[in-house]
Structures are given as structure tokens and as C-alpha cells.
């Protein structure tokens, strides 16, 4: 049975041209994380392996850095960066637990932070 | 060049344990990290599983009971145990080298292959 | 674990013409999907990585595709690329391998 919950940064706001930790966690499970992949849509943006280490994809090699943690920092955003961002968990032996982020970036600089929440 | 060159008897008793050791030259095993697939004949490749950088290791779980990949830096070798074979096992068997950082699961250099036959 | 089903099983094309090549996950894997070219007697050749990038030093092949369908293109077939071609997931461990697609000479 998955007893786990992930805790995301929720809605967030960035600036155009600036940078945003998009940040999960998993908690209320003992399951064993292996693995973290880092979505946008259908893209992959990054996977944190336990054993390996990470893997940044090479269509955002320059503009995205690994963490800190298990998250990821997206750095020079543009407007076509708004949209939904998903952290998918996988692990032993619950299986896979997915967060979902949605960031918007703004032209202007009244960009704010929104608050946590959780997807059980 | 790196180069990767297994090794070890063709044929193999059922119910014994079948070892193989793959080789590397021109590279050190110190990064990276090192495979094992293998191919039953007019079947799919089926991964095996994986020794990385710092010794961690990971297995297939459809091979988990049965299997132990080691390796030896100082021969720069890493080897294949597989415990209680049938003809199942019967297969060419390959090691290849990967580069999780830049491609992630994606395998870049493999071994000629070493066929492995499980007959009494 | 991610089961990948590749189509047509062969495939024969005349040479200087489009080949493509097709493979289905069986759930969602984003672009983490690896092709390889398997010639007779001889190990698999990684050809793309991360669905669409071509590894160094090969040409004519080129690879699209996200989430759950992707496509193998040779844009103008060579008589050495006659061949067993295979795609590979590695969203989530196991990776996983398609059972391949042959491709010959018209």
C-alpha cells in the first residue's frame, strides 16, 4: 500500500530572464527512493538516479542545474517556460508517486511565490 | 579506443553457475558505469543489470535471486555470476559501458558478445 | 516493467529510400528512449539517445517522438544499413528493449 505523500512548491511565479528551484518531497513512507525524474509535458528536463547520479537532458543542458537535493534549478526562463512541471518518484517498493508544479513566468518583476500544498 | 572483452566457458551444466568477466582497456572503470545484457537466441535483449562508478550495484528483479555483478579495478574487469541455470539462460551475453551524465541509459560501448550455451 | 513494441517486424526498402521504424511504450517515458543498430554477427551500436540526438559520429539515422510513440528514420537507405534495429527505454529500471525491427534490401 503507498502511505507516501509528495509535498511540492505548488504555484510559483518567476521572472523572465531569472531563475526557479522547482523543489518535491516525499515523506510518510519508509519506501526507498531510486530514482527522481523531472518532467515538462512529454519532455524530460532531468533524472536523479541513487546509484548514478544525474542525468540532465540534452535539450536543457544549458539553462537547467541539478538541485539542490533531489530538485532542480531552471535557470534563464523565458515566458514559453510557463506550464506544469512534474516530479516523478520512483520507488521500492511502494511503486511511483508523482508532484505536480506549476510555474508561471512573468514579464514583469511582481513575481511571488505561491503557496505549498500537497498531492497525496 | 575503450575497448570491452568478454570472457568465459561456452557451455555451461544446468543447475550450476555460469561466470563471466568482461574486460576494459583504454578507459578506467572508475567513472562511468558497466553493464550487462544479454540475447536468448531469436529473443529481445534483456538487461541484466549494472555496476556503477562506486561499486553500486543493480539488478534486473526478474534475475534479482539468482544474480551478482562484481568488479575488480585494479584488473580493470568487471564480472557476471548467474546461479541455478536452465536452458533459459541460454544466450548471447554482452557488456557495455555507459555514461549516465551525458546519455543517461543509453549504452555506447559493448562487447563482440560471448555466447553462453546451458545443455547437459 | 515498461514493455516496448516495435513495428513493422521487417522492413525491406530500396536503396536511396526512407526507412521508419516504429516503437510503443507501454506507458509514458518522456524522451528517455535509445536506439541501436544490430548488424548480422556483430553487437548493437547506439545510433540516438534522449529520443531525438544522434550519437557521434552517425549518419543519415535520425529519431523523434515523446511520451509513449516514437520513430526511427534512415533518410536514404545505404546497403550497409541492412541491420536489426532496436529502441530502449530507460524512464524507469528495468530498461527495457523492443523486440526489433529488420531491415532489408527491396
Known amino acids: 500500500m503507498m502511505t507516501g505523500t509528495i509535498e511540492t512548491t505548488g504555484n510559483i511565479s518567476a521572472e523572465k530572464g531569472g531563475s526557479i528551484i522547482l523543489q518535491c518531497h516525499l515523506s510518510s513512507t519508509t519506501a526507498q527512493v531510486t530514482q527522481v525524474n523531472w518532467e515538462q509535458q512529454d519532455q524530460l528536463l532531468a533524472i536523479c538516479n541513487a546509484d548514478l547520479g544525474w542525468h540532465i537532458s540534452p535539450s536543457f543542458k544549458d539553462r537547467v542545474a541539478p538541485g539542490p537535493g533531489l530538485g532542480l534549478t531552471l535557470q534563464s526562463l523565458t515566458v514559453n517556460d510557463t506550464g506544469e512541471y512534474f516530479c516523478i518518484y520512483h520507488t521500492y517498493p511502494d511503486g511511483t508517486y508523482t508532484g505536480r508544479i506549476f510555474l508561471e513566468v512573468l514579464e514583469s518583476s511582481v513575481a511571488e511565490h505561491g503557496a505549498r500544498f500537497q498531492i497525496p | 579506443e575503450v575497448q570491452l572483452q568478454e570472457s568465459g566457458p561456452g557451455l555451461v551444466k544446468p543447475s550450476e553457475t555460469l561466470s563471466l568477466t568482461c574486460a576494459v582497456s583504454?578507459?578506467?572503470?572508475?567513472?562511468?558505469?558497466w553493464n550487462w545484457i544479454r540475447q536468448p537466441p531469436g529473443k529481445k535483449l534483456e538487461y541484466i543489470g549494472y555496476?556503477?562508478?562506486?561499486?553500486?550495484?543493480y539488478y534486473n528483479p526478474s534475475l534479482k535471486s539468482r544474480v551478482t555483478i562484481s568488479r575488480d579495478t585494479s584488473k580493470n574487469q568487471f564480472s557476471l555470476k548467474l546461479s541455478s541455470v536452465t536452458a533459459a539462460d541460454t544466450a548471447v551475453y554482452y557488456c557495455a559501458r555507459g555514461d549516465y551524465s551525458n546519455y543517461g541509459g543509453a549504452m555506447y560501448d559493448w562487447g563482440q558478445g560471448t555466447t553462453v550455451t546451458v545443455s547437459s | 516493467d515498461i514493455v516496448m513494441t516495435q513495428s513493422p517486424d521487417s522492413l525491406a526498402v530500396s536503396l536511396g529510400e526512407r526507412a521508419t521504424i516504429n516503437c510503443r511504450a507501454s506507458q509514458g517515458v518522456s524522451t528517455t528512449i535509445a536506439w541501436y543498430q544490430q548488424k548480422p554477427g556483430q553487437s548493437p551500436k547506439l545510433l540516438i539517445y534522449?529520443?531525438s540526438y544522434r550519437y557521434t559520429g552517425v549518419p543519415r539515422f535520425s529519431g523523434s517522438g515523446s511520451g509513449t510513440d516514437f520513430t526511427l528514420t534512415i533518410s536514404s537507405l545505404q546497403a550497409e544499413d541492412v541491420a536489426v534495429y532496436y529502441c530502449q527505454q530507460y524512464y524507469s529500471s528495468p530498461f527495457t528493449f523492443g523486440g526489433g525491427t529488420k531491415v532489408e534490401i527491396k
Open positions: 534522449s529520443a
Open positions: 555496476i556503477s562508478y562506486s561499486g553500486r550495484t
Open positions: 583504454g578507459y578506467s572503470m572508475t567513472s562511468d558505469y
